[in-house]
């Protein structure tokens, strides 16, 4: 039995693979900020994590997913203040009683250091120094992703 | 200057109603979740209510759940408990205190400012 | 009867280091919950003085120290002044609300 959030990124992901390819994204839409390989958006408003999840959908994009503690790092260096907490991808998955990304993937134990209990209906959050289980339904801010894939220049055969 | 000064303790008989108000000041107070915590005399703090700074959200100590509602007016920056069927155990300070973390209650939070106290009194 | 414990009250001479303990369990301290702590000196409001287990706000000074590990936490005081007596809570979060421990009273000898 999956839990509302459950269903809701599983949906969200299977429509999104439904869509046809985009061009890959060269540079980073107006207010994104890049990272690497990729742009963020920081909210300004403030949703619960399930409503953050489709915020970001619509957006074409996902809910930030952190692929080790350096990538966790370089993320809150651009969180300005530490009193502000921001959703990422991150939630309890009560079925395999284990965090899951929702890319589908589990959290490797050694890549963050969680601060709260993992239980039913608690999703995961940042700060400027931390990363914290809280309740799903807590208002707060998000981090939406966009991944850039720079396209490779054709080579055409001489005609 | 962060300030919190509340008001509207007193005397009141068992069973009465009483509301609180505290005024706040030097900052953003629609930003921040606010809460009430409470002191009996010559007891410990204990956490009694909690509201998200747009108000849409409350939490509230099993203690006063049905009993006391938590509000607040961002136009007048003021945070309110109404406090109703109230008891001699519900004598104690009332302290208004600001939530570290912005928005909403945090399960994390701390409160950073706390007002004076105003003292609520239930006795016949 | 609160979810978290402190000693009633500790003791030291001006200079020493003294420290005070937060005892909880698996709901609370245990489930990673960050642990916060408060001076309230006589006739006052609490002050926040610890928070999120070591941090600590601008203005306390650091003879102010606080740590966590496992189920329990605590608040180290050293180089004990006079101005330092007063009542000491420790605050974490359990089955869904803020609580605190029962206080601990600090005098300095």
């Known amino acids: 039995q999956k839990s509302s959030i459950e269903k809701c990124s599983v949906d969200i992901q299977q429509s999104r693979n439904k869509t046809t390819e985009r061009p890959g994204l060269l540079n980073c839409p107006i207010y994104w900020q890049q990272l690497r390989e990729k742009c963020l958006l920081f909210s300004h408003t403030v949703n619960p994590w399930n409503n953050s999840l489709a915020d970001c959908s619509t957006k074409e994009s996902s809910l930030l997913l952190i692929r080790d503690k350096d990538e966790l790092i370089h993320t809150q260096n651009l969180i300005r203040d530490k009193a502000i907490l921001f959703w990422i991808g991150l939630n309890f998955s009560l079925s395999e009683k284990n965090w899951k990304w929702i890319n589908g993937s589990f959290l490797n134990s050694n890549d963050l250091e969680i601060r709260g209990d993992a239980k039913e209906n608690s999703c995961i959050s940042i700060s400027q120094t931390s990363v914290y289980s809280e309740y799903c339904s807590t208002e707060i801010r998000w981090i939406c992703q966009k991944e850039l894939t720079p396209v490779r220049n054709k080579v055409y055969p001489d005609s | 200057e962060v300030q919190l000064v509340e008001s509207g303790g007193g005397l009141v008989q068992p069973g009465g109603s009483l509301r609180l108000s505290c005024a706040a000041s030097?900052?953003?107070?629609?930003?921040?979740?606010m809460s009430w915590v409470r002191q009996a005399p010559g007891k410990g703090l204990e956490w009694v209510s909690a509201?998200?700074?747009?108000?849409?959200?409350?939490y509230y100590a099993d203690s006063v759940k049905g009993r006391f509602t938590i509000s607040r007016d961002n136009s007048k920056n003021t945070l309110y408990l109404q406090m109703n069927s109230l008891r001699a155990e519900d004598t104690a300070v009332y302290y208004c205190?600001?939530?570290?973390?912005?928005?909403?209650?945090?399960?994390?939070?701390?409160?950073?400012?706390w007002g004076q106290g105003t003292l609520v009194t239930v006795s016949s | 009867q609160s979810v978290l414990t402190q000693p009633p009250s500790v003791s030291g001479a001006p200079g020493q280091r003294v420290t005070i303990s937060c005892t909880g369990g698996?709901?609370?301290?245990?489930?990673?919950?960050?642990v916060h702590w408060y001076q309230q000196l006589p006739g006052t409001a609490p002050k926040l003085l610890i928070y999120?287990?070591?941090d600590r706000p601008s203005g306390v000074p650091d003879r102010f120290s606080g740590s966590k590990s496992g189920t329990s936490a605590s608040l180290a005081i050293t180089g004990l002044q006079a101005e330092d007596e007063a009542d000491y809570y420790c605050?974490?979060?359990?089955?869904?609300?803020?609580?605190f421990g029962g206080g601990t009273q600090l005098t300095v000898l």
């Open positions: 205190a600001r939530d570290y973390y912005l928005y909403d209650y945090i399960t994390q939070t701390s409160f950073d400012y």
């Open positions: 030097g900052f953003t107070f629609s930003s921040y979740a």
């Open positions: 999120g287990n070591s």
């Open positions: 605050q974490s979060y359990d089955s869904g609300h803020t609580v």
């Open positions: 509201i998200s700074g747009s108000g849409g959200s409350t």
């Open positions: 698996s709901s609370n301290i245990g489930a990673g919950y960050d």
